[in-house]
Each structure stands twice: as C-alpha cells, then as structure tokens.
C-alpha cells in the first residue's frame, strides 16, 4: 500500500529500523545514541546554512518475541515485518536507515516499491550490489574482492615480484556476518575473484586447514581467512607452518592493530592482516565510549547515515527541490560528504569507499607494520614499507605455487 512520507513542510523524519537480527551484536541503545548524535550535527549544519527546518528520527523496533535470534541468517522476514508495521502506521520518513543483514536488505529491496532511499550499515553480500536506492556505509564484499584480485596480480613491487593466481579460502560457517559474506563472495563460482584465479579451494574443516600448513603437495601457498588473531590462534595454535605459506587475515573492522602497546603474537608472523585505515576522532565521542573497537565502525555507519541524509537534504532544500521524489531516492551515490570522522566517499552504486591497509608482523619489533594501502575508489595499491622485515625468505612474499621461492 502507498505509505505517505513524513517529509515536507519543513519537517523531515528519518525512519530507523532497530532490528533484533543485526550484522553486529550491538545494543540498540548504542545505535540510538549514534543516531541522536548525528541528528544534533545535522541540525547544526542545516541551521548554519540558514535552513530553518526540523529533522527527527523515529525508531522502529521489531517484535522481539518473533525475531529474537540476533543472527542475520534468520533475518529475512524481520525487515518485511518492520515495513508492514510502518505501512500499518502510515508513517514513513524521508529515508530508511536500517537493515544491516544481507538477507533482510535483499528481501526488503525485492519486495517493496522503493521510492525512498535506504541506507545500510552492513548488507555486505554480493546480492546487495548495484541496487539503485541502496547506500552501504560499511565496505561490501565487492570492494574486498577487488583488492584481493589487485593484490594477487601485483608483481612489480620490490617485496612482491610474483603474480599470484591461486588460493585456499578457509570458511567453516561460524563466521560473523561481515566475514560470512566476504568469504561467500570469494567462494562464489561466478564472482570476479573466482573468475580471475586459476585455482581456488574452500577449506571447511579445521583439520583441512591445519593439514595444508605443512602439506608438501598443497596447490597454493596462500590461505585467505576472516576474523581476528584469536580466531586464527584457535585454529592454528602453535603448529609449524611451511616457510612459504602466506595467510591473509581479513579483519576490516578492527583497529586494535594500530594501538601503541599492541605486540603481535608469534603465530602472526606468517600472516598479512587486511584491515581498514583507522579513524581518529571516535575515541572520545560520547556514543562510542561504551563500544569495543570492532563495534565502532557499525555505530559510526549509523551516525554517518544520518549525516549523509543531512547532506542530501541540505542540497535539495538549497536547490528548492522536492524530497519525496525518485530523484532524491537515487541521489545517494557518486558523492563525498562530511562524515563524523572526515570525508566519506560513495561510489557510483552508493557503496562506501575506503582505504584498506595490509599489515605484516615485523620480525624485528614484533609490531604490526603497514606494508601497503589500497584505495577502493581508484582500485590502486600504494606501497608504504619498502623495506619490510618479513619472516619470508629474502624479505619478499613467496610465490603462490609451492616449490618456487622468491626470485
């Protein structure tokens, strides 16, 4: 049914879906705080621009009795139930900030006439790519794939002189929501990653992973996995690892590696960690005080969603344009706006661009060091440490195929 949008006459509302099933197990109170902090900033920015309007958020909670698993994999119907609730109440904002689970976002996008923008903190899966009115404020799987292919092909860096074309992917099904979809994208036979690699095998059992570490007949020296160092240790322990094994640990939303007092444990010496360049101003923020480093990005995405709406609202109001039009719904892409922690860039499909950072463990200092950075916006790698103190022979990354050492 046609739902009227509370989005005119100087009063603009944001519908925030507060779902029990969420990409990160974050107390809804923390997300409310993030949204409210964002609203304060937006009101100030609009006031500064001479726009005397009201901006509010309505928090829509799902029925916890029905949807209480907290697990994204059972989230498909929750988003639709919330939309039904909005429909019954005949109360929809100018924008929907909500579902973070790939399943619920995909289903909501499929089953509704989206004449309003949808902003998601999550929705990492490939099935949420290229959606015309969906904006994603946390790095989706597509961006990870493009980095990996770029890095695999790189062969003209002093510390990486071989192109790689093979990989193992460890995926045991217990991953967090972000990791689940990142690895799902790497596993998919029709994905860009699979298309560009000559050999790729998914390891699903702990023992498979453990056996590969010293298997002389392995088909690749490179293993991709997703999670934190503790996750790797649970799996790998102190087992011996062949000297030309490279483990790529995808841990995007974790800035603990950049903390001053962090020392890399010995089991990380064969590991390259892929993470995001850390923010700086969040540490003292009122909404982030209670957040762990891994949760900051999630709350920040909610906050930035509010700021993005404020940015677009300001532009449309200044141009005298209507907010409840398809033009507004399709405008949340191919732009840069002032986020909470600095400029945020969205690509042509409304997905956030970021700087990914590849870290290695220095054998000298036992510290995590930046090896290179990757700008997802231009799909380009920038070497940082030109003299890495690697564990690998000659301080160069080995070939991905067993039996051929660094040249």
């Amino acid at each position: 049914s046609q739902v009227s949008q509370n989005c005119h006459n100087g009063s603009y509302e944001i519908s925030v879906l507060m779902m029990g099933n969420s990409a990160f197990a974050e107390p809804l109170k923390n997300l409310e705080d993030a949204v409210n902090e964002g609203l304060e900033i937006v009101r100030g920015r609009l006031q500064n621009a001479g726009l005397n309007v009201t901006v509010n958020a309505t928090f829509m909670y799902s029925d916890g009795l029905i949807h209480n698993s907290g697990d994204c994999r059972s989230s498909t119907c929750e988003g639709l139930d919330l939309l039904r609730k909005i429909s019954n109440a005949q109360r929809m904002g100018c924008v929907l900030i909500g579902p973070s689970c790939t399943y619920s976002t995909f289903q909501m996008y499929l089953d509704t006439e989206l004449s309003y923008p949808m902003i998601s903190a999550g929705s990492f899966g490939l099935s949420c790519d290229y959606k015309e009115t969906l904006t994603r404020l946390m790095s989706p799987a597509r961006k990870l794939m493009y980095f990996l292919v770029n890095f695999w092909k790189t062969n003209d860096l002093p510390f990486k002189t071989y192109s790689w074309s093979t990989s193992y992917v460890y995926k045991n099904g217990t991953e967090t929501e972000d990791c689940f979809w990142y690895l799902n994208a790497l596993e998919a036979s029709v994905s860009y990653f699979s298309h560009e690699l000559g050999f790729k095998v998914v390891l699903r059992q702990d023992k498979e992973f453990q056996d590969i570490l010293m298997d002389h007949n392995r088909k690749s020296n490179v293993i991709i996995m997703c999670g934190g160092p503790e996750f790797l240790y649970k799996l790998k322990g102190d087992r011996a690892v062949a000297e030309d094994i490279v483990i790529i640990l995808v841990d995007l939303f974790n800035d603990q590696y950049f903390e001053d007092n962090v020392t890399a444990p010995d089991y990380m010496k064969n590991v390259l960690v892929l993470t995001l360049s850390p923010g700086n101003s969040l540490l003292n923020s009122s909404f982030s005080r209670n957040l762990s480093p891994t949760k900051r990005d999630f709350a920040l995405a909610y906050l930035n969603g509010i700021l993005l709406f404020g940015h677009m609202l300001k532009i449309f109001l200044e141009n005298g344009e209507n907010i409840t039009t398809p033009k507004f719904a399709h405008a949340f892409r191919n732009l840069t706006f002032e986020g909470y922690d600095g400029p945020v860039t969205l690509d042509d499909w409304g997905d956030v661009d970021s700087t990914m950072v590849l870290l290695y463990t220095s054998v000298d200092t036992k510290k995590y060091k930046v090896l290179l950075t990757y700008d997802t916006h231009v799909n380009k790698t920038y070497p940082v440490d030109m003299s890495p103190t690697f564990t690998w022979k000659n301080s160069k990354l080995p070939n991905d195929i067993t039996g051929r050492g660094p040249q």
Epitope: T365, S387, K396
Partner: antibody, heavy 119, light 107 residues
C-alpha cells in the same frame, strides 16, 4: 664505466612542459629501479619519483598530477615528463639508481640538469 | 609521510675535530637511514647506508649509528676535503625523504 647522464634542462615559461632524459651506461639498466631527485637553488634534496624494475611508478604526492616518470629499457634511458611548470619547479634535477633490495639508498647519481622556470 | 629533521643546520669546526650531526625521523624507520655528502655544484655522494655501513671507497673516519628514530653521523677527524653539506635520507617508506642538510665549514 657505470654512469648516469641527464639532459633536457633549460629555461621554460610557466605553464609549459619539458621532458628530461637520463641515459644509463655500464650496468644492466632494466634490473634497477631509477629515481628522479631535485634540488632547488640553495635548498635541500627532494625525492620526486621512482620507476621500479618491474615498471611500477611511484610519486611524491606533490608531483603526481603534473610529472610522469617513464623508461625505455631498450634505450637504457629514464624520462621525466613535466607539465604545467611553475616557478617553484626551478631546480637541478638528478636521476639516481638505488641500491639492492631492501636498502633504498642512492648509490649512483647523474651530474644533474638545471631547469629554470621563468617568464 | 616521514619527516627527517637534521641538526645543526650548519657548524664550523677545526681540522682534526670530531664532528657530529644528528638526524631524527618522525616515525620508526628501523635502520634504513643513509648519509650523503654534497659539495657545491656537484651531485650528492653516498657515504653510509643502513645506518652504519660504509659505502665502498669512503674513508673510515666517517661513521654512523642509531636505530628507530634517532641517528648520528660522525666525522672522527675533520679534513679540509670534508667541507660540504651532509644529508640524511630515510629508505623505509615512500615517499623517500631527506633531512634539510647540515653545512660543515672549517674554522
């Protein structure tokens, strides 16, 4: 003997372009990364760009939009294409070959070529 | 980007004196620190690489030490031919960067 010889410097008007060359001899040019380093009159040394043996190019961010480094291994020559030149680009431009990985020192330098940007 | 700060910017010493120049990096560069000598109108010449390794053909009166962020370059007994400007350079991360130079003169 092992040497690098720059050429192509001279006086050029602001906004114009210039291409510098650096001829290498006495060593296997294609095996080495080679750099451009510049020095404004009375000032210190400033790293401009490198082209690695594999062909990858990296720049000082200050020059990435206006300068392009390239090489022709068949001619044992390094180039620096400089566009939209400004008065502050006035400097002696040196090409230099670096040492072996992972020691990025400049072991071999050319004699330099002076570029003067003036109207 | 890593900033390299040299001190002093100039010094005057007598022949036979021990001369010390310091170089500080804005972040840890391990031992990837090199020293050059440049005489007026000439190209720089490599003296020391990787903090303390003497380049072939360079007199043993030149030496270097340090690690991490703080480095020292020493001429144990200054000679007239050592009159020049000396530069440190980090070779750890791109963009490679130089100190602003120390001009050494004879009293």
């Amino acid at each position: 003997q092992v040497q690098l010889v720059e050429s192509g410097g001279g006086v050029v008007q602001p906004g114009r372009s210039l291409r510098l060359s650096c001829a290498a001899s006495g060593f296997t040019f294609s095996n080495y990364g080679v750099h451009w380093v510049r020095q404004a009159p009375g000032k210190g040394l400033e790293w401009v760009a490198v082209i690695w043996s594999g062909g990858r190019k990296d720049y000082n961010a200050a020059f990435i939009s206006r300068f392009t480094i390239s090489r022709d291994n068949s001619k044992n020559t390094l180039y620096l294409q400089m566009n939209s030149l400004r008065a502050e680009d006035t400097a002696v431009y040196y090409c230099a070959r670096h040492g072996t990985y992972p020691y990025w020192y400049f072991a071999l330098w050319g004699q330099g070529t002076l570029v003067t940007v003036s109207s | 980007d890593i900033q390299m700060t040299q001190s002093p910017s100039s010094l005057s010493a007598s022949v036979g004196d021990r001369v010390t120049i310091t170089c500080r990096a804005s972040q840890d560069i391990s031992n990837y620190l090199n020293w050059y000598q440049q005489k007026p109108g000439k190209a720089p010449k490599l003296l020391i690489y990787y903090t303390s390794r003497l380049q072939s053909g360079v007199p043993s009166r030149f030496s270097g030490s340090g690690s991490g962020t703080d480095f020292t370059f020493t001429i144990s007994s200054l000679q007239p031919e050592d009159i020049a400007t000396y530069y440190c350079q980090q070779g750890k991360t791109l963009p490679f960067s130089f100190g602003q130079g120390t001009k050494v003169e004879i009293k």
